[in-house]
């Protein structure tokens, strides 16, 4: 299987992980976290990094702590820097994580999913049009 295909699988897997965590929003610490939305073009990877850095945490209540902690840790899996597309070129002009609106876990996860969907769409489009961006 090609690296590009594996990359797509990993991105879709992240969406599934977000979906799983959405089942447990009541078991997450109700902390407000930077949640990028309407991310400008070429800042997607920067925003992705902000989502990964956010301190999403299990509230350690109930019996779902294990699956929550495993899922959060898998959400933070770092893609290789070569996959970051134009991330390096445009990083200086992208908003800092702190500048994004802070949202509770439910909205944080919804916005993360939205960004992942956008990135997958862009990735597919760039492949269709022969671009080297991934």
């Amino acid at each position: 299987m090609q690296g590009q295909d594996r990359h797509m699988i990993r991105m879709r897997q992240l969406i599934d992980i977000v979906d799983q965590l959405k089942n447990y929003v009541n078991d997450l610490v109700p902390e407000f976290l930077p949640a990028p939305e309407d991310v400008e073009t070429n800042c997607e990877w920067s925003a992705f990094s902000c989502f990964q850095k956010a301190q999403l945490k299990s509230a350690n209540t109930g019996n779902n702590e294990r699956i929550i902690n495993v899922s959060i840790k898998k959400l933070k899996r770092k893609p290789p820097s070569t996959n970051a597309g134009r991330r390096q070129k445009h990083r200086l002009t992208c908003p800092s994580c702190d500048s994004y609106e802070k949202k509770p876990p439910k909205e944080f996860l919804e916005r993360f999913k939205s960004l992942l969907q956008k990135m997958i769409h862009q990735h597919l489009s760039s492949r269709t049009h022969g671009s080297e961006d991934s």
């Epitope: 699988i9 897997q13 599934d16 992980i17 979906d19 799983q20 902690n69 899996r77 770092k78 996959n83």
Partner: antibody, heavy 126, light 106 residues
Framework: QVQLVESGGGVVQPGRSLRLSCAAS????????MHWVRQAPGKGLEWVAF????????YYADSVKGRFTISRDNSKNTLYLQMNSLRAEDTAVYYC???????????????????WGQGTTVTVSS | EIVLTQSPGTLSLSPGERATLSCRAS???????LAWYQQKPGQAPRLLIY???SRATGIPDRFSGSGSGTDFTLTISRLEPEDFAVYYC???????FGQGTKVEIK
């Protein structure tokens, strides 16, 4: 080929200790989380413990928490299960299993246990 | 913690017949987190299906998985003699197993 081989099982008295080992070969051991799963005679599968690929996190079933310790030595491609304060209900075949989700972004991506050892039998009896 | 309930406990069928095994979760499970295993007597389990519907490497296409939310199904389209075994579903991440369904020869 990809292989897991458990050892260290045996007959032990209640309250005593035992250490199981699982030797891995045929794959990059340090890129995979690892599990211990057990099966009591005539019963179903029971997950016991999991360790992250780099040993940074460990998780345990409630039935063994505080008594069992999972560890790994990536330089030796070996997984361990230290079992203390053993009870009769710990009698089972113990399997080590590889977690199918590699730490490598381009690696395996299976949310499941994709490689299993043949098992080692632990009998706790006085 | 999530509980996975498999049904039926035992399925008595003949070779060539279709087997339908059910796995019901006590709370919603993302499809990616649901796996199925096969275990034959005296052998270690084998991963059959991951992500609720994807066959693991080397698994024949007579095995298929489906479902979402709380209801998942493993289907064996035409039972071969080597398919008579115990089947377990599992939620990834909590690593909870169902109690198993035994598929035996009628």
């Amino acid at each position: 080929q990809v292989q897991l081989v458990e050892s260290g099982g045996g007959v032990v008295q209640p309250g005593r200790s035992l250490r199981l080992s699982c030797a891995a070969s045929g794959f990059t051991f340090s890129s995979y989380g690892m599990h211990w799963v057990r099966q009591a005679p005539g019963k179903g599968l029971e997950w016991v413990a999991f360790i992250w690929y780099d040993g940074s996190d460990k998780y345990y079933a409630d039935s063994v928490k505080g008594r069992f310790t999972i560890s790994r030595d990536n330089s030796k491609n070996t997984l361990y299960l230290q079992m203390n304060s053993l009870r009769a209900e710990d009698t089972a075949v113990y399997y080590c299993a590889r977690d199918g989700d590699s730490s490598d972004w381009y690696g395996d991506y299976y949310f499941g246990m994709d490689v299993w050892g043949q098992g080692t039998t632990v009998t706790v009896s006085s | 913690e999530i509980v996975l309930t498999q049904s039926p406990g035992t399925l008595s069928l003949s070779p060539g017949e279709r087997a339908t095994l059910s796995c019901r979760a006590s709370q919603s499970v993302s499809s990616s987190y649901l796996a199925w295993y096969q275990q034959k007597p005296g052998q270690a389990p084998r991963l059959l299906i991951y992500g609720a519907a994807s066959r693991a490497t080397g698994i024949p296409d007579r095995f298929s998985g489906s479902g979402s939310g709380t209801d998942f199904t493993l289907t064996i389209s035409r039972l071969e003699p080597e398919d008579f075994a115990v089947y377990y579903c599992q939620q990834y991440g909590s690593w909870t197993f169902g109690q198993g369904t035994k598929v035996e020869i009628k």
